[in-house]
Interface confidence: low
Amino acid sequence: MADNFSLHDALSGSGNPNPQGWPGAWGNQPAGAGGYPGASYPGAYPGQAPPGAYPGQAPPGAYPGAPGAYPGAPAPGVYPGPPSGPGAYPSSGQPSATGAYPATGPYGAPAGPLIVPYNLPLPGGVVPRMLITILGTVKPNANRIALDFQRGNDVAFHFNPRFNENNRRVIVCNTKLDNNWGREERQSVFPFESGKPFKIQVLVEPDHFKVAVNDAHLLQYNHRVKKLNEISKLGISGDIDLTSASYTMI
């Protein structure tokens, strides 16, 4: 995969609302995550049962539907080492990473179809200048996608595009602490389409996550979990065919 932009400038030089290189239009972004602070919603699927944890491919056992979500063998390369090939973001001109991430990456899942739900380990947690990239295709008649940046049992950042919430498409962001979800932040700009490929990029900033989809800035979400180094895994679930999930330092 080749990208036609560099994210190097996104973190160099504070105060620039539209740093060159961050995908898409960067100016005029709303305050908060999507500009809907304080909005709440009484449940994701009121009045109906959820479509199941694994829509379209129910796990074997107590859950009706087609078998195959869990074929009984681990997915190839669930916890792979760094790939041997060059990364998506060439290291030339980029600052070197320090700490838990000694190289500019990318690390994570190998290219190719991955079993969803998928768990991407983030050893050492997340740190500013870290870029997580998820590539896949939305399934036809999709209902939902979810990214969950997890700190133990807590969900530091839940990114949840919903394709049909009361006949609306909306993206809900939230945090779960001690099994309780907090205030939802909602975004009505919805760049996902059923049956279409997508690229989600999450850039970790010192005080927030930035999310871009298909090279266009979508939203930012202020950190509610402050111990970034303890956000040690990313869960990817929903109605998608997942091609790759990786991270790199920029």
Partner: antibody, heavy 124, light 112 residues
Framework: QVTLKESGPGILQPSQTLSLTCSFS??????????VGWIRQPSGKGLEWLAH???????YYNTALKSGLTISKDASKNQVFLKIASMDTADTATYYC????????????????WGQGTSVTVSS | DIVMTQAAFSNPVTLGTSASISCRSS???????????LYWYLQKPGQSPQPLIY???NLASGVPDRFSSSGSGTDFTLRISRVEAEDVGVYYC?????????FGGGTKLEIN
């Protein structure tokens, strides 16, 4: 076909440590979303959840019980283990292992497959 | 901890008629994501428990549609529309909204 089978010592004395093994087939504990846990049932009484371990090595314990519970796994051998230190006669029960599933957004699912249980008697 | 409360015995029922088993939780099991983390299990005599209902209203695989479940955040009812002899056993409600996961004490289905 998913199956789980518990094994243990059968009888042990008070203050000893109970070691249980759950051997399973038909699924892999290396697969994202999978978990296996332990539940016990004293004769003629109800069910009590003890501990659970997940594919990513997260461990959940029933902290309302006495300390001394330790759950672990060997995913390559399709086995989950439970140790309970300082067993007492009140810990006499049938011990079950069961499979569970988790999704990051939809949460936990029912324990869909259970072993047949192994009887543990604590007696001096 | 969330306490799950059940009556020890059901009202005696006649084969072919309907039965209801109740369960109450000490705290709402309705999550802000809209899912109610309430489960029903049946333990037949001499057997391991088996799942009947997950997330309050979803029928587990292989469970006949004679079984149904409904409720609010704290009060739940399992209904069996046409009781058969094979339905005899102890019915447990359970929650896994919060740790520790807890079970009710079980309700024994009594048949006339």
């Amino acid at each position: 076909q998913v199956t789980l089978k518990e094994s243990g010592p059968g009888i042990l004395q008070p203050s000893q440590t109970l070691s249980l093994t759950c051997s399973f087939s038909g699924f892999s504990l290396s697969t994202s979303g999978m978990g296996v846990g332990w539940i016990r049932q004293p004769s003629g009484k109800g069910l009590e959840w003890l501990a659970h371990i997940w594919w990513d090595d997260d461990k959940y314990y029933n902290t309302a019980l006495k300390s001394g519970l330790t759950i672990s796994k060997d995913a390559s051998k399709n086995q989950v283990f439970l140790k309970i230190a300082s067993m007492d006669t009140a810990d006499t029960a049938t011990y079950y292992c069961a499979r569970n599933l988790y999704d990051g957004s939809y949460g936990y699912y029912a324990m869909d497959y259970w072993g047949q249980g192994t009887s543990v008697t604590v007696s001096s | 901890d969330i306490v799950m409360t059940q009556a020890a015995f059901s009202n005696p029922v006649t084969l072919g008629t309907s039965a209801s088993i109740s369960c109450r939780s000490s705290k709402s099991l309705l999550h802000t994501n809209g899912i109610t983390f309430l489960y029903w299990y049946l333990q037949k005599p001499g057997q391991s428990p088996q799942p009947l209902i997950y997330q309050m209203s979803n029928l587990a695989s292989g469970v006949p549609d004679r079984f149904s479940s409904s409720g609010s955040g704290t009060d739940f009812t399992l209904r069996i529309s046409r009781v058969e002899a094979e339905d005899v056993g102890v019915y447990y409600c359970a929650q896994n909204l919060e740790l520790p996961w807890t079970f009710g004490g079980g309700t024994k289905l009594e048949i006339n």
